[in-house]
């Protein structure tokens, strides 16, 4: 049978097994989600993209799944990230009371996975899936992350933190999920401030990256939305993590502040 050839890699091998196993594990680790029926979650996930043309997926397609995965993060505990996922996850694994999207059920299920189906067949396409740039933006994976990222930002409250990669040419990138979705969906009536943590890459890098033009652009966008903005440099990410693990260490002074400058804007 003829199958459309897309430019992106195909569905992750053993996708259904992985999603179901992750769901079961998540509900075991998080007792507050014990009520979740993982078979229903998988059925809703599958229903969002199976038998549908993979360049015509909508946020509406994912609503049944979003409904099943409803979760709230306590105020001041949301951690967004852009182009620095691994460090963000290492941080929340230590700082257990803060949460990235991938620490929530739906983000956890889909992290690092690719998936797509085909129009009018019940098959999962393991050969190829649409690439965001080369094929289309309304593909199953991109629409999923846009949907859950929007919801994650909308439900955030208090002081929201974001980890940004100081090694990138655009520390804040308007085209990233953070820049194009999350920033615009923070609710000013619930979010008092956004605090950016700019992570330095080089050992000897002592520049104040909070003065970077793209950070100024982020500050402008946030301020216009009536949300206060703060920025901190984290010069030594390894030291930063170490101090989160062992805050009483004498070299850490007052918690995380030892490893970065603090800028109020």
């Amino acid at each position: 049978r003829w199958r459309q050839q897309w430019s992106g890699s195909g569905t992750t091998s053993r996708f259904p097994e992985t999603v179901l196993a992750r769901c079961v594990k998540y509900t075991e680790v998080h007792p507050e989600m014990r009520h979740v029926d993982c078979q229903s979650v998988w059925d809703a996930f599958k229903g969002a993209f199976i038998s549908k043309y993979p360049c015509n997926i909508t946020e509406e397609d994912y609503q049944p799944l979003v409904k099943l995965g409803t979760q709230t993060v306590p105020c001041n505990k949301t951690l967004l990230w852009s182009r620095i996922k691994d460090l963000a996850h290492q941080f929340t694994q230590v700082q257990r009371d803060m949460f990235t999207l991938e620490d929530m059920l739906l983000g956890y299920l889909a992290d690092d996975l690719t998936w797509c189906g085909e129009f009018n067949t019940f098959e999962i396409n393991y050969q190829s899936c649409p690439d965001w740039r080369k094929d289309c933006s309304n593909n199953p994976v991109s629409v999923f992350w846009k949907t859950v990222s929007r919801r994650f930002a909308e439900t955030a409250c208090g002081v929201v933190h974001v980890m940004l990669n100081g090694s990138r040419s655009k520390i804040f990138d308007k085209n990233s999920t953070f820049g194009s979705v999350e920033v615009h969906n923070l609710q000013p009536e619930k979010v008092q401030a956004l605090e950016a943590w700019v992570i330095h890459g080089g050992r000897e890098d002592s520049r104040d990256l909070c003065q970077d033009p793209t950070i100024k652009e982020l500050e402008s966008i946030i301020s216009k939305r009536n949300i206060r903005f703060f920025c901190k440099n984290i010069y030594r990410p390894d030291k930063f993590l170490q101090c989160v693990k062992n805050p009483e260490d004498s070299s850490c002074l007052s918690g995380i502040s030892a490893s970065h400058h603090h800028h109020h804007h």
Epitope: T18, K25, V29, H89, D111, D112
Partner: antibody, heavy 117, light 107 residues
């Protein structure tokens, strides 16, 4: 306390069948993912199959897919592995294991399956 | 499938020594990794889950660390009863895959 006891192993000729059982006690059998893991003589551990708590989802390693069937009887608190078309390379100690939080937290003592003519 | 590579494949150490075993994943697996101990003729036993959480009843000399692709099992003061083969296991992407094992012998 949690206990898993396998049975049903033995010597069998290539191409023949065998059914392994794993009797579970000390926990609610229907609330956990149950797995079979095997270990060939002198070799490492290899995952074989899983059945999720409600029995509606069963998954297999490529090496046994189409030949082995995992099943469970919640009323008997027993896990099964039906092994058909056995091959010499299926010779191993077969363990049943309970999965909790992504880890095999309890294992049976194992049952040896020898496929030989 | 994700490949898990353990090193060393075997080691010999004295009672009281600090022993370190590493496990490297062929791709990032977050902290979805466990460590198991297996003695000859016995079933494996869970020591560490979620990369660093000590399983109930396991002596505190065992500890796990790491995230992403590189993980470590440390035995802080080796005891005679720690003579065994140790395996890592990932469950990040199905199916679960084990490392090839590290045999620890007492000098």
């Amino acid at each position: 306390q949690v206990q898993l006891v396998e049975s049903g192993g033995g010597v069998v000729q290539p191409g023949r069948s065998l059914r392994l059982s794993c009797a579970a006690s000390g926990f609610t059998f229907s609330s956990y993912g149950m797995h079979w893991v095997r270990q060939a003589p002198g070799k490492g551990l290899e995952w074989v199959a899983v059945i999720w708590y409600d029995g509606s989802n069963k998954y297999y390693a490529d090496s046994v897919k189409g030949r082995f069937t995992i099943s469970g009887d919640n009323s008997k608190n027993t896990l099964y592995l039906q092994m058909n078309s056995l091959r010499a390379e299926d010779t191993a100690v077969y363990y049943c294991a309970r999965m909790f939080r992504g880890a095999f937290d309890y294992w049976g003592q194992g049952t040896l399956v020898t496929v030989s003519s | 499938a994700i490949q898990m590579t353990q090193s060393p494949s075997s080691l010999s150490a004295s009672v009281g020594d600090r022993v370190t075993i590493t496990c490297r994943a062929s791709q990032g697996i977050r902290n979805d990794l466990g460590w198991y101990q297996q003695k000859p003729g016995k079933a494996p036993k869970l020591l560490i889950y979620a990369a660093s959480s000590l399983q109930s009843g396991v002596p505190s000399r065992f500890s796990g660390s790491g995230s992403g692709t590189d993980f470590t099992l440390t035995i802080s003061g080796l005891q005679p009863e720690d003579s065994a083969t140790y395996y890592c296991l990932q469950d990040y992407i199905y199916y679960p895959t084990f490392g090839q094992g590290t045999k620890v012998e007492i000098k």
